[in-house]
């Protein structure tokens, strides 16, 4: 008789696929652009990467740190009407996509929480999360909350809002700390929150080194749902030299959670070739006449336009890995194990009861390496077989579909390979 | 024709506060990024920041040797540029130039207004 | 910050001959998705505001003579002036503008021997 099928648990929509900040909507859109009509025209790229969630915003009226000049229930006429936003909505729904409502307040100010005046802004967040409730947003973001005094009382509270609302509306905080303790102690009485940091912001260094903060968040955030990016706001090509970008996105769409991205982070969008642009708000490069600035900046393999084109791609890179993310049940909500491979590679497994499992092994360091992949670490369900199929790497050159024996596995420098093996009982 | 022309430098003592001002023809203004550069008498040149564009929303970027003293602004009906200095000190005594950027190499510069502070 | 060194000093060549001016960078400025270097030039002459002679590395400014030519990559670059003339007395600066904040070299001060 064949073994009984594990129960599936319950699967709200952000842990699907992955989410998508557009923070700057004029720097996403380009020059003299910008607003919440020009975004519902991108909206099908979005659909393209296959991502669940807009993270939107803030949009709302800040004049910089006057709070009686902040109201998070009007638009910034810049970005445009509130009819505009409904059409967003509707559009964005249409195409599946859910849209999640920044209302960090200060958020063009120094203090992103009006520090002396936190009681007033409170009673503003409450506001506007019933407002944009009915109005039919998804859920929030809340950043900075560091600067936030009293933060885990206030999140419990707008969290009870959001949730009483509807148990499939999602409420994020993003912090800039990246100490595990006061992590931990953020989602310890908030039961349901995604909260997204700076945690993974130093793990560029070692395979070991990042096995370890992936494992002990893990650890220690038990079996609630996780998020992993590298920071609240900001780009990918902040943290990681360009060589990293692959096997990061790699890992980040296999890792057990919702991986959270910035715009321009599935192309590889980089501030530091732009000359004059803001770091943390770059131009998006949708093709080479994005930035105008200056001639000969960009070329074609910096944007969407020219990467779309190309298979070998990070930006196709992307597309792939959201799609195998939001299809494979071991992706979706699978068991995590790490394992041993050998200095400088961080190598685990996703697997769900009899459905195909999947290996990732990953090497940070640059130099080759033959992974020893350590299966006695592993659980018996969760053992190795002597073949994998290699599903993609990282690097071009691997012919794909092609079972790699995993005794004799090597991997090139900066090398990320996603492997696939059918369950066996 | 280009034009760019400096104003508002002179003596003043450390501590105390200076604007400096830009005053620009020949161009759009709105279409450029301006910067501020300063040469110390005998020295090389160095960069303070600048102020970009209309499309990038008139958002600044400063040196850190400036960075909370130094404010760079624009008057965009006027067509100029200003840089205001305060908590002056001594090491700040140089020729102060203003650029229309391309934004990262500067291709039109003033002729420069000299600030000495000193006591 | 970036730091840009620049040697020699001073330099005294005789007219018609070629001056070779060197600046290194403490990191490379070359970006790799569009393998452009992130070093412009300029010459001031004594009592004037400087001027843009070659940006990313080796492109001359419009109006620039072709006497002046720039090279180099990652972090050594170089500028010649082929046939040294009387007018090309001043100091020389390159700049980078690959990461802010912006950065000048010490200059390099050019003489008739």
């Known amino acids: 008789r064949a073994p009984r099928c594990r129960e599936l648990p319950a699967q709200k929509w952000w842990h699907t696929g992955a989410l998508y900040r557009i923070g700057d909507l004029q720097a996403f859109q380009g020059h003299g652009a910008g607003n919440l009509a020009g975004l519902k025209g991108r909206l099908d790229y979005l659909s393209s990467l296959k991502v669940k969630g807009l993270v939107l915003g803030p949009i709302h009226k800040n004049q910089k740190d006057d709070v009686a000049q902040t109201d998070l229930l009007q638009i910034d006429p810049n970005f445009g009407s509130k009819e505009d936003f409904d059409s967003l909505l509707q559009s964005a729904k249409k195409k599946s996509i859910r849209v999640i409502l920044d209302l960090t307040p200060n958020y063009r100010g120094e203090n992103s929480w009006f520090s002396t005046q936190v009681d007033t802004v409170a009673t503003k967040v409450k506001d506007a999360l019933e407002f944009w409730l009915q109005a039919g947003v998804d859920g929030f973001q809340v950043r900075d909350i560091e600067n936030l005094k009293d933060a885990s009382s206030f999140l419990a509270e707008w969290q009870n809002i959001t949730k009483g609302f509807s148990e499939d509306r999602l409420l994020i905080a993003g912090t800039n700390s990246s100490d595990l303790q006061q992590i931990l102690s953020l989602l310890e009485s908030n039961k349901d929150l995604l909260l997204t940091s700076s945690y993974l912001s130093d793990s560029g260094s070692t395979g070991e080194h990042t096995k370890s903060l992936v494992t002990q968040y893990l650890n220690a955030t038990g079996n609630r749902w996780c998020s992993w990016s590298l920071s609240q706001a900001r780009l990918l090509t902040s943290f990681l030299p360009a060589q990293l970008l692959r096997l990061y996105q790699l890992m980040l769409f296999t890792l057990p959670g919702t991986p959270v991205f910035s715009y321009g982070d599935e192309i590889g969008l980089d501030a530091a070739a732009l000359p004059g642009q803001p770091m943390e708000a770059p131009v998006m490069l949708w093709d080479e006449s994005s930035f105008p600035d200056i001639p000969g900046a960009v070329s074609a393999n910096m944007t969407v336009k020219g990467q779309s084109e190309d298979p070998g791609s990070l930006l196709s890179l992307f597309r792939r890995l959201s799609d195998q993310r939001s299809k494979e049940r071991s992706l979706l909500h699978g068991d995590f194990h790490a394992f041993s491979a050998g200095p400088g590679l961080f190598s685990y497994i996703r697997h769900w009861d009899q459905n195909e499992r999947f290996l990732v092994v990953l090497n940070f360091g640059d130099v080759g390496l033959s992974a020893g992949l350590q299966a006695s670490d592993l659980p018996a369900s969760a053992s190795l077989p002597a073949k994998a199929d290699l599903l993609l790497s990282t690097q071009p050159g691997r012919e794909e579909g092609s079972p790699l024996e995993l005794e004799r596995l090597k991997l090139e420098p900066h090398e990320g390979l996603l492997l696939r093996f059918p369950y066996a009982a | 024709e280009v034009q760019l022309v400096e104003s508002g430098g002179g003596l003043v003592q450390p501590g105390r506060s200076l604007r400096l001002s830009c005053t620009t023809s020949?161009?759009?203004?709105?279409?450029?990024?301006m910067s501020w550069v300063r040469q110390a008498p005998g020295k090389g040149l160095e960069w303070l920041g600048f102020i970009r564009n209309k499309a990038n929303r008139y958002t600044t970027e400063y040196s850190a040797s400036v960075k909370g003293r130094f404010t760079i602004s624009r008057d965009n009906s006027k067509s100029i540029l200003y840089l205001q200095m305060n908590s002056l000190k001594t090491e700040d005594t140089a020729v102060y130039y203003c650029?229309?950027?391309?934004?990262?190499?500067?291709?039109?510069w003033g002729q420069g207004t000299l600030v000495t502070v000193s006591s | 910050d970036i730091v840009m060194t620049q040697s020699p000093d001073s330099l005294a060549v005789s007219l018609g001959e070629r001056a070779t001016i060197n600046c290194k960078s403490s990191q490379s400025l070359l970006y790799s998705s569009n393998q452009k270097n992130y070093l412009a030039w300029y010459q001031q002459k004594p009592g004037q505001s400087p001027k843009l002679l070659i940006y990313w590395a080796s492109t001359r400014e419009s109006g620039v003579p072709d006497r002046f030519s720039g090279s180099g990559s990652g972090t050594d670059f170089t500028l010649t002036i082929s046939s040294l003339q009387a007018e090309d007395v001043a100091v020389y600066y390159c700049?980078?503008?690959?990461?802010?904040?912006?950065?000048f070299g010490g200059g390099t001060k050019v003489e008739i021997k």
């Open positions: 700049q980078q503008y690959y990461s802010y904040p912006y950065t």
């Open positions: 650029t229309r950027d391309r934004p990262a190499w500067f291709v039109y």
């Open positions: 020949g161009f759009t203004f709105i279409d450029y990024y």
